[in-house]
């Protein structure tokens, strides 16, 4: 694969990663695909410091991250271990709420207006954040 040594235009560098903040909305899966088309992934939050950085850039707006439990357990899109990793859920979240009337529960995680996390219906058109690591050879995932 190829190595990225500096961030693309319109991306923000922070702690050896590049971040791109959308200004419009997509469903979680479409946002995920968008990041893949950018050779990136939905943001994976691994520390309080990274949480504060992302929160600062997105402001008080619902924003998708790369965390979901569509196949059962919660998983980060880049394979980062969820159980042992950083978490910042709102109180009593995630709750897989079924009361929204849209069918099913809530399988995708997003930053809320105060930065803490909530699980929500994956089809909601929220903003999103893409992330790609610098100095890391790009992988060749399977065809979609």
């Amino acid at each position: 694969g190829s190595e990225r040594t500096c961030c693309p235009v319109n991306w923000v560098e922070h702690e050896r990663s590049c971040y791109w903040f959308s200004r419009s909305g997509k469903a979680w899966a479409d946002a995920d695909n968008y990041c893949r088309l950018e050779d990136a992934h939905l943001v994976v939050v691994t520390s309080w410091e990274e949480q504060k950085f992302v929160q600062h850039h997105i402001g008080p707006v619902n924003t998708w991250m790369g965390l979901h439990d569509q196949n059962g357990p919660w998983k980060w899109v880049d394979g980062t271990d969820y159980e042992t990793g950083f978490k910042n859920w709102r109180p009593e979240q995630p709750d897989d709420w079924y009361g929204h009337g849209l069918g099913g529960g809530e399988d995708c995680a997003h930053f809320t207006d105060d930065g803490r996390w909530n699980d929500d219906v994956c089809q909601r058109p929220y903003r999103w954040v893409c992330e790609t690591e610098l100095d890391k050879a790009s992988q060749e995932p399977p065809l979609l």
Partner: antibody, heavy 121, light 107 residues
Framework: EVQLLESGGGLAQPGGSLRLSCAAS????????MTWVRQAPGKGLEWVSA????????FNADSVKGRFTISRDNSKNTLYLQMNSLRAEDTAVYYC??????????????WGQGTTVTVSS | DIQMTQSPSSVSASVGDRVTITCRAS??????LAWYQQKPGKAPKLLIY???SLQSAVPSRFSGSGSGTDFTLTVSSLQPEDFATYYC?????????FGQGTKVEIK
């Protein structure tokens, strides 16, 4: 000047193969996702495939999945479409196009002139 | 898949006329919509992106509007070079899909 030049079209038999190429110039090729779009004779436009800048991620229309493969060689500034198991309904003009408008994937801003693929026995 | 339905399929108009073409998405695509112009034997040309943003070097007589599921392309005063076929494209979700096209013909 940004330019895209397709080649490789021609006549193929049903079940046969062709490889289309698209030579890019005038921009940093590896920084942009690319796509193929086709147009059957007298018909509308149909999106076929897209590929990320590194080539690491690809997306395909259901109509070509398992038969067509999009790829790129950034050292040669060239985009490819490998077309296998060709069918009569694949007959079309094939366009390559550059993705990215205002740093967003709102669509294709630069197109090649197209190359014609005819599938017939 | 998201279906894009354009109307009308063709329209006859005269130079100076105001022409409006609509595109309806089968589900919400916010503003992930572009409009293209295509002339016979030529590649499509981008006119509008993000539903309402005018591509550079495109004449200001072209404008786009809409969000969600209903979108409009308007040519405020048709010029001889505007007789062509127009397509909408959604890039909200894969597979990306085009409308079936609207042919603008000389009356």
């Amino acid at each position: 000047e940004v330019q895209l030049l397709e080649s490789g079209g021609g006549l193929a038999q049903p079940g046969g193969s062709l490889r289309l190429s698209c030579a890019a110039s005038g921009f940093t090729f590896s920084s942009y996702a690319m796509t193929w779009v086709r147009q059957a004779p007298g018909k509308g436009l149909e999106w076929v495939s897209a590929i990320s800048g590194s080539g690491g991620n690809t997306f395909n229309a259901d109509s070509v999945k398992g038969r067509f493969t999009i790829s790129r060689d950034n050292s040669k500034n060239t985009l490819y479409l490998q077309m296998n198991s060709l069918r009569a309904e694949d007959t079309a003009v094939y366009y390559c196009a550059k993705l990215g408008i205002d740093y967003y994937y709102y669509g294709m801003d630069v197109w090649g002139q197209g190359t014609t693929v005819t599938v017939s026995s | 898949d998201i279906q894009m339905t354009q109307s009308p399929s063709s329209v006859s108009a005269s130079v100076g006329d105001r022409v409006t073409i609509t595109c309806r998405a089968s589900q919400d695509i916010t503003t992930w919509l572009a409009w293209y112009q295509q002339k016979p034997g030529k590649a499509p040309k981008l006119l509008i992106y993000d539903a309402s943003s005018l591509q550079s070097a495109v004449p200001s007589r072209f404008s786009g509007s809409g969000s969600g599921t209903d979108f409009t392309l308007t040519v405020s005063s048709l010029q001889p070079e505007d007789f062509a076929t127009y397509y909408c494209l959604q890039t909200n979700s894969f597979p990306w899909t085009f409308g079936q096209g609207t042919k603008v013909e000389i009356k």
